[in-house]
Every structure is written in C-alpha cells, then in structure tokens.
C-alpha cells in the first residue's frame, strides 16, 4: 500500500548500555472525531464527513505493523521478521535495545472499511542511540520500585537529571493509556497501591532548527512491600511435646513464616540436643509451601526411621533465621501410653 499519505512521527530512544530496557511504539491512529487527518488528501480539516469512516481507537487491537527497509524493499510484516519485537494490541514492544532497532515503522488498521481508510496509517521514524553523556551519573532507572502504603515517585529516565523548573512538558502513559493530568518529569504518588504497578512511558519534545523529535523512555514500575522488621515466626510445631510410638517411623515438620526481604537468605534447620551435646541433623531440603508478596512459608522436615528410647531423652530443635534475627522451637518426644 502507498505510505505517502501516512502521518509521520519521529521518535528518539536513547538507551543506557548499563541496563536492560524496553521500548514501545503506540499505533497513534486518530480517534473518530479527529480522523479527518487519515484522509486529509480528500478533505480539508473543516470538511468533516457526516459519518466518520475510520474505525476509531476502540478497535485498535486490530492493527498491522510493518517495517520499511532502508534499501527501498517492500514493507516487511513485523511478526514474521523480528523475534525481539512483540505486538500487543496496538503497541509494539521492543524487548532489547540496540541501534539495529532504528528505522521506520508503519501501522494501519487490518480492516479497511472504506476508501478513506487506505491512507489511515501512521509512520514512525525511530532513531536509537546509546547514551553517551556521562554528565548525568544518577539518571533514573528503567526499573523503579514503589513501596506499598508509602509516598513515592516515578521519574522519567531521560529527564531525571533536570530540575522540575527547567524540565519540558512531559506526556505520560500507563499501560498504553494517556495520563492526561501528569505533565512534569516526575509523577508523585501520595499513597502507593498495587494498581500503581505497570509499564509507564514518558515522552517529551526535543527540537532543533531542522525538525522536532519525541524523546521516549519506558519505565517498568513494580510495587513492593518494605523489608520486614521482624524475625521469622514458627507456625509448626506449636506444642513442645509430641506423643510418639516406639519403633515406629516419625516425621516432624517445621513450618516458618519469613517476611519479605529484597535480599532473602532464609535459614531453617533442625538440630538435636542430648544432655550437653548439640548437633545439626542432615534432613531433606527446605521447601516453600506458600508464596505471597508479603511472606514466604518454608517447611523442613526431620525424619526418624524409627523412634528409639534414646530419642525420648533428646530435644529436637527447629532453628529459623533471617537478617533480623532467629527463632527456635524445641520438641520433646513422649511415649504414647495405652
């Protein structure tokens, strides 16, 4: 199809060689009320037709993306040629940075419903450059964490070294939707909830004497709980004595709850106390039996092939520890009567 009638947008992706980042292109086809630009070669902006023929943005999952080879070859279907680029509804996701992503990307509706729609397309000229200036050493990361329940902020990586006063107007998107009230280089969140997690995009315009570009950066925001201030607690065993039958096999389970820690090195082990002696027991691997955002429940069993008289004189101790501290629970075996 003829792409000369497509509207054109220029975008710049300056990526950091230090970090993994993603990038997105939105298929910015016009909404029905603005759709006259799709067929501007037929109508002036004032001559809006009685029924607007373009399908509008509510059906933008049905768009086709192409790349225009620089050598003038025919347009290539993105899905067939570029495994590191994913189409999700009307968004094109670039999973890896690199100058080889530079080029022209075209999107248009899959369903051409009227002659007007033929020219309803957007051509995005993407320039990709590695970040060169080391002047801004502490630029914001493309992966930012927000602490649940507290105040936080999301910074636009490409503008994070500029003060709010000198920052240009920024357009923000969250999960592909425009955040119309946000115009600064930083989004301030008064209280962080789970729904603040997502993919944020910040755009601003950079102009020179020749042309203007949209500078875009993508930020993956996740909401996290703060590191626990508590040592782990033992959920099982609860009792400090356990009735057993001599000569029978026995499994004692130790289950402990560990609060969230970004650097998580839990310890859960069994040891035996016998009068003045104490030794660690070789037991099966610890395993997580529940995993939530706030805590991890880990279980470790001690297995006795058969309970002996000697075992009744011993204490079996479960020891659990995180970076805050440790907790123990001891169990004394008692012969079952009758």
């Amino acid at each position: 199809f003829n792409i000369s009638g497509c509207s054109t947008k220029k975008l710049l992706w300056t990526y950091s060689t230090r970090s993994e980042e993603e990038f997105v292109l939105f298929c910015d086809l016009p909404e029905p009320q603005k759709s006259h630009f799709c067929h501007r070669n037929r109508l002036s902006p004032k001559q809006v037709p009685e029924h607007l023929p373009f399908m509008g943005s509510n059906d933008l999952s049905d768009v086709q993306w192409y790349q225009q080879p620089s050598n003038g070859d025919p347009l290539e279907d993105i899905r067939k040629s570029y495994p590191h680029i994913i189409q999700d509804k009307c968004t094109l996701h670039f999973l890896t940075p690199g100058v080889n992503n530079s080029g022209s990307y075209i999107c248009r509706p899959k369903m051409i419903k009227s002659p007007y729609d033929v020219a309803c397309c957007v051509k995005m000229i993407l320039e990709v450059k590695p970040q060169t200036n080391a002047s801004c050493e502490y630029s914001a990361s493309h992966k930012q964490d927000l602490l649940l329940g507290s105040t936080g902020s999301i910074s636009c990586p490409s503008l994070s070294c500029q003060s709010d006063a000198q920052s240009p107007a920024v357009t923000w998107y969250k999960n592909g939707k425009l955040l119309s009230v946000e115009r600064s280089n930083r989004i301030v969140v008064d209280e962080v909830y789970d729904y603040h997690q997502g993919t944020y995009v910040c755009d601003y315009t950079q102009s020179d004497t020749v042309s203007s570009w949209t500078v875009r950066a993508v930020v993956q925001v996740r909401t996290i709980v703060g590191d626990t201030k508590l040592k782990p607690d033992i959920l099982d065993p609860v009792e400090d004595t356990l009735e057993v039958e001599l000569g029978k096999p026995l499994t004692i389970s130790c289950k402990a709850r560990f609060g969230f820690e970004r650097v998580f090195n839990p310890v859960i082990k069994w040891y035996i106390k016998d009068s003045d002696l104490e030794w660690e027991v070789s037991v099966p691997e610890a395993k997580s039996i529940k995993s939530t955002l706030k805590d991890e429940i880990i279980e470790r069993n001690i297995i006795l092939e058969k309970v002996t008289q000697r075992d009744l004189r011993r204490k079996f101790v479960c020891f659990v520890q995180n970076s805050i501290g440790n907790t123990t629970q001891s169990v004394q075996l008692k012969e079952k009567r009758g």
């Epitope: 996740r222 969230f260 998580f264 090195n265 839990p266 310890v267 859960i268 691997e285 610890a286 395993k287 997580s288 039996i289 529940k290 995993s291 939530t292 955002l293 706030k294 805590d295 991890e296 880990i298």
Partner: nanobody
C-alpha cells in the same frame, strides 16, 4: 541472587522429542513454583507447564498429553519432557520460579521444530 540455567533446547523434526532442564542456584530452599514458559516470535510469553511443591501440576491445553514436567526438590531442578513435538511448539523456552509471589526467569533456550 537467584540464577536459573536452562539446557536441552535445539532443532528437532516434527514428531520428535526433546528434554529441557533447568537448575536454580543461589537459593537455599526449593521455591514454591517451578515451571516453564515459552515465547514464540512476535507473541506474548505463555505458560507451558508448572509444578508446585507438593506435586500438583498445571499444563497449557496445547501441550497436555505430550509434555510432562518433573521436579527434583533436593537438587532444585525442573525438567520438561517434550514428546510428539509440532512446528507450533517452536519458541524460546524459559525456566521460571516464584519467590515472594514474584517471577524470576532464566535466559531461555531455543526450541525449533521443523516440519
């Protein structure tokens, strides 16, 4: 830090078999969930199969009866036995574990099924 190392990918003809393995290191316990996802060119990452501690398994409809997942809790490994492979199974296969309700991923291993 948790590291996930996949192996066993490769090129195979339709109807053939492959066995993918993944070992988790840098972790002192067996994670709640271990499993496999895959991503075909231009598509979203999707679940293939996973297994929770205690043994319950979950398979994508498209692989049921053809793929089998195994876990070795002591060694912190997860294995995917893939039989009767189809061209549609061509993708990068990623090992996946869950800690604090969040996913960690391996680098991926390419599986290509030719017709």
């Amino acid at each position: 830090d948790v590291q996930l190392q996949e192996s066993g990918g490769g090129l195979v003809q339709a109807g053939g078999s492959l066995r993918l393995s993944c070992a988790a290191s840098g972790i002192t316990f067996s994670p709640y969930v271990m499993g496999w996802y895959r991503q075909a060119p231009g598509k979203q990452r999707e679940l293939v199969a996973d297994m929770v501690n205690g043994g319950s398994t979950n398979y994508a409809d498209s692989v049921k009866g053809r793929f089998t997942i195994f876990r070795d809790t002591a060694a912190n490994t997860v294995t995917l036995q893939m039989n009767n492979l189809k061209p549609d199974d061509t993708a990068v296969y990623y090992c996946h574990i869950m800690i604090f309700g969040r996913a960690s991923w391996g680098q991926g291993t390419q599986v290509t099924v030719s017709s």
